[in-house]
Interface confidence: medium
């Protein structure tokens, strides 16, 4: 019989409230035997793989994703999946990451943790719709 | 080769229901693509009615579509549905569905059904 | 709802012409923009994905930019069988929308 897959689950480090030019690294975690992790922006506009994937603890595998300096089009609705073969995973939750005018500097503390995981299979079709895309920022070619 | 066959016409009287079939071969269809439903008016442009996971069931709708399409998938045949209910001559038109897959780091429709003509008339 | 503003509705161009059509989203640079070309009869056929990817198999006369929120198709030397209709679409924000098309003649 086929193996049921967990959700997996994403967070951000420092957190979701990012200062414009710092850094942020999304945390996706599975269960251990992920090849590919995927972190989706938006209502699945672009993605990002990577098969970089280490063993987080003895039951969970994380990747990394890292944006160096955050734009204000890098602020929107993230998520991940995985692939184990031979499937892929439901979604994570959505978790929103929001882009601030600087004040502090790229070292300033003033960042809210945060990680979005839960039962719910996917968001309702209507929790992401009125977020519109930030004024400038992401290119159309890259997730970020 | 992937491919998407849509059942075949309908001519129905307005109140009716009417189930269009999707069936994929050439891909796992339980594999991570979505299936989207689109609705093309006579010599109108294209309306996107909603989407389906097949992996689990879960939709997404447009909100003018809502209470009017239903969409359902049957794994063991690789099949999605359609349903609409309550026909009117507004809902005469092409429907398409189209498979969400996904390249070079984008998702997109980028394979069609040959399109089911619904007619309401009485 | 991100409104997908397309124009021109139709043109007319010669074979070997340069030929553009233009999307305009009301809101948002975050796009990811396709392109598809519908024959009479037919369903769309997928062009550009990303807004300025080539699908595979797509003749590479047919190229897409992007400037801000205007999207642009373009054809670089017009062929007989590119008479069709081609309408963008943008595939980021729910409800996914598409512009109101573009026919598109051979003088």
């Known amino acids: 019989q086929e193996e049921d897959l967990p959700r997996p689950s994403i967070s951000a480090e420092p957190g979701t409230v990012i200062p414009l030019g710092s850094h942020v690294t999304f945390v996706c975690r599975g269960p251990v035997g992920v090849q590919t992790f995927r972190l989706e922006r938006d209502s699945r506009s672009t993605y990002n793989d990577t098969e970089d994937v280490s063993q987080a603890s003895p039951s969970e595998s994380e990747a990394r994703f890292r944006i160096d300096s955050v734009r204000e089009g890098n602020a929107g609705l993230y998520r991940c999946i995985y692939y184990k073969p031979p499937k892929w995973s439901e979604q994570s939750d959505y978790l929103e990451l929001l882009v601030k005018e600087s004040s502090g500097g790229p070292d300033s503390p003033d960042t809210e943790p945060g990680s979005s995981a839960g039962p719910t299979q996917r968001p309702s079709d209507n929790s992401h719709n009125e977020h519109a895309p930030a004024s400038q920022g992401l290119k159309a070619e890259h997730l970020y | 080769e992937v491919q998407l066959q849509q059942s075949g016409p309908e001519v129905l009287k307005p109140g009716a229901s009417v189930k269009i079939s999707c069936k994929a071969s050439?891909?796992?269809?339980?594999?991570?693509?979505?299936m989207n439903w689109v609705k093309q008016s006579h010599g109108k442009s294209l309306e996107w009615i909603g989407y389906?996971?097949?992996?689990?069931?879960?939709?997404s709708y447009n909100q003018k579509f809502k209470g009017k399409a239903t969409l359902t998938v049957d794994k063991s045949s690789s099949t999605a549905y359609m349903e609409l209910r309550s026909l009117t001559s507004e809902d005469s038109a092409v429907y398409y569905c189209?498979?969400?897959?996904?390249?070079?780091?984008?998702?997109?429709?980028?394979?069609w059904g040959q399109g089911t003509s619904v007619t309401v008339s009485s | 709802d991100v409104q997908m503003i397309q124009s021109p509705s139709s043109l007319s161009a010669s074979l070997g012409d340069i030929v553009t059509m233009t999307c305009q989203a009301s809101?948002?640079?975050?796009?990811?923009l396709n392109w598809f070309q519908q024959k009479p009869g037919k369903a769309p056929k997928l062009l550009i994905y990303?807004?300025?990817n080539l699908e595979d198999g797509v003749p590479s006369r047919f190229s897409g930019s992007r400037y801000g929120t205007d999207f642009t198709l373009t054809i670089s030397s017009l062929e007989d069988e590119d008479m069709a209709t081609y309408f963008c679409?943008?595939?980021?924000?729910?409800?996914?929308?598409f512009g109101g098309g573009t026919k598109l003649e051979i003088k």
């Open positions: 189209a498979r969400d897959g996904y390249s070079s780091n984008y998702y997109t429709m980028d394979y």
């Open positions: 050439g891909y796992t269809f339980t594999d991570y693509y979505y």
């Open positions: 389906i996971y097949p992996n689990n069931g879960a939709t």
């Open positions: 809101q948002g640079t975050s796009i990811n």
């Open positions: 990303g807004a300025s």
């Open positions: 679409l943008q595939h980021t924000y729910l409800p996914y929308t």
